[in-house]
C-alpha cells in the first residue's frame, strides 16, 4: 500500500475579513485508519478547528463529502473570517486508536487577513 | 463569557494527596488546550502542568512524578491529582485557558492549597 | 529552561507619569514573550502577547517592545487601576512556560 501523504498546496491564503477562506487539504491513502483533524497552530497548545468525528463546528464546513470512505479530500472552509482567525492551519493525519494517535500532519497553510474592502 | 471555576483546595500534610477540579464554561473546552499555574504566598507565578487538545501531558520538572493532569470533555472539567504533596507545593492555583499562541487569555480566580505539619 | 529576569523589582510612579520596565531571557525567544498584569487577590489578566500585540480589550496605553532577550512593557500615562504586579512569561511553542519575578508598580 502507498505511504500515506499529506497535501497542503497553499503555503499561504490571504483572505478578506468577512469573506470565507478555504484551506486545502488531499491524503494520498486511505490507510491508515483513522480521522482527519484540522488545527491552527503547532504544539501543545495548537487550537482543535474541525474533527471529523465531534463538533459542531459553527463556521467550518468540509468543500467535499468527508463521511465517503473512499474521500481523499478533507478542504475545509472557514466562514466569515476575522482579523482573529490569521495563523497557520495544519491538516492532521490521526490512526484509530484507544485514544487516536497523530501519525502525519500536512506543511500547514499560513493564513492572513485583509481588512474588508470599503 | 468564558468561565473558569477552581475547587478542592484545602490544608493537607506533607505526603498526603489532594486533587483540584477546574469548571469550564463559555468557550468550546474540547478544543483548546488547558494549564495550571500556582502562586505561592508572596511569591511569582510558576508553571505547573498543561494538557493539549488531544490529551497529551507536560509538567513542570518541580511536579514530575507528583502531579497528574487530566481532562473530561463531556465534563468541561479540567483536574489536577497531587500526590506526594510538599511544603513547598503550598500555593494558590490557578487553572487557564490556553490560546494557540502558547499564552493563557483566560484565568480562574484560584483555589489555595496548604501543606503543612 | 529560558530564564526571565525583570527589572526593576518594584517601581514607584505618580499617576499620570509614564512607567518602563523591562524583562530579559536567558536566550532568544524571538518575539515571543507576554505580559501579564496582576492586582491583590485577583487572578493574573493577559495585556500583550508576541511581544507587542495588545490582548482583546487592553487599552492602548499599553505597550510592548523588543525581540530577542531584551523586551520592555510601556505604560504611557499610568492610571489609578494600573498599580499592580506586571510579569513577563516566554510562549515558545514548547512547555516549560516560565515567567519573570515580576515587576511591582506603586504610587509614588
Known amino acids: 500500500e502507498e505511504e500515506l501523504q499529506i497535501i497542503q498546496p497553499d503555503k499561504s491564503v490571504s483572505v478578506a475579513a468577512g469573506e470565507s477562506a478555504i484551506l486545502h487539504c488531499t491524503i494520498t491513502s486511505l490507510f491508515p485508519v483513522g480521522p482527519i483533524q484540522w488545527f491552527r497552530g503547532a504544539g501543545p497548545a495548537r487550537v482543535l478547528i474541525y474533527n471529523q468525528r465531534q463538533g459542531p463546528f459553527p463556521r467550518v464546513t468540509t468543500v467535499s463529502e468527508t463521511t465517503k470512505r473512499e474521500n481523499m479530500d478533507f478542504s475545509i472552509s472557514i466562514s466569515n473570517i476575522t482579523p482573529a482567525d490569521a495563523g497557520t492551519y495544519y491538516c492532521i493525519k490521526f490512526r484509530k486508536g484507544s485514544p487516536d494517535t497523530e501519525f502525519k500532519s500536512g506543511a500547514g497553510t499560513e493564513l492572513s487577513v485583509r481588512a474588508k474592502p470599503s | 463569557d468564558v468561565q473558569l471555576v477552581e475547587s478542592g483546595g484545602g490544608l493537607v500534610r506533607p505526603g498526603e494527596s489532594l486533587r483540584l477540579s477546574c469548571a469550564a464554561s463559555?468557550?468550546?473546552?474540547?478544543?483548546?488546550?488547558v494549564t495550571w499555574v500556582r502562586q505561592a504566598p508572596g511569591e511569582g507565578l510558576e508553571w505547573v502542568s498543561l494538557i493539549s487538545v488531544t490529551g497529551t501531558t507536560y509538567y513542570a520538572d518541580s511536579v514530575k512524578g507528583r502531579f497528574t493532569i487530566s481532562r473530561d470533555n463531556s465534563k468541561s472539567t479540567l483536574y489536577l491529582q497531587m500526590n506526594g504533596l510538599r511544603a513547598e507545593d503550598t500555593a494558590v492555583y490557578y487553572c487557564?485557558?490556553?490560546?494557540?499562541?502558547?499564552?493563557?487569555?483566560?484565568w480562574g480566580l484560584g483555589t489555595l492549597v496548604t501543606v503543612s505539619s | 529552561e529560558i530564564v526571565l529576569t525583570q527589572s526593576p523589582g518594584t517601581l514607584s510612579v505618580s499617576p499620570g507619569e509614564r512607567a518602563t520596565f523591562s524583562c530579559r531571557a536567558s536566550?532568544?525567544?524571538?518575539?515571543?514573550l507576554a505580559w501579564y498584569q496582576q492586582k491583590p487577590g485577583q487572578a493574573p489578566r493577559l495585556l500583550i502577547y508576541?511581544?507587542?500585540t495588545r490582548a482583546t480589550g487592553i487599552p492602548a496605553r499599553f505597550s510592548g517592545s523588543g525581540s530577542g532577550t531584551e523586551f520592555t512593557l510601556t505604560i504611557s500615562s499610568l492610571q489609578s487601576e494600573d498599580f499592580a504586579v506586571y510579569y513577563c512569561q516566554q510562549h515558545t511553542d514548547w512547555p516549560p512556560y516560565t515567567f519573570g519575578g515580576g515587576t511591582k508598580v506603586e504610587i509614588k
Open positions: 508576541d511581544a507587542n
Open positions: 487557564a485557558k490556553v490560546t494557540w499562541k502558547n499564552v493563557f487569555d483566560y
Open positions: 463559555g468557550f468550546t473546552f474540547t478544543n483548546y488546550a
Open positions: 536566550q532568544t525567544v524571538g518575539s515571543k
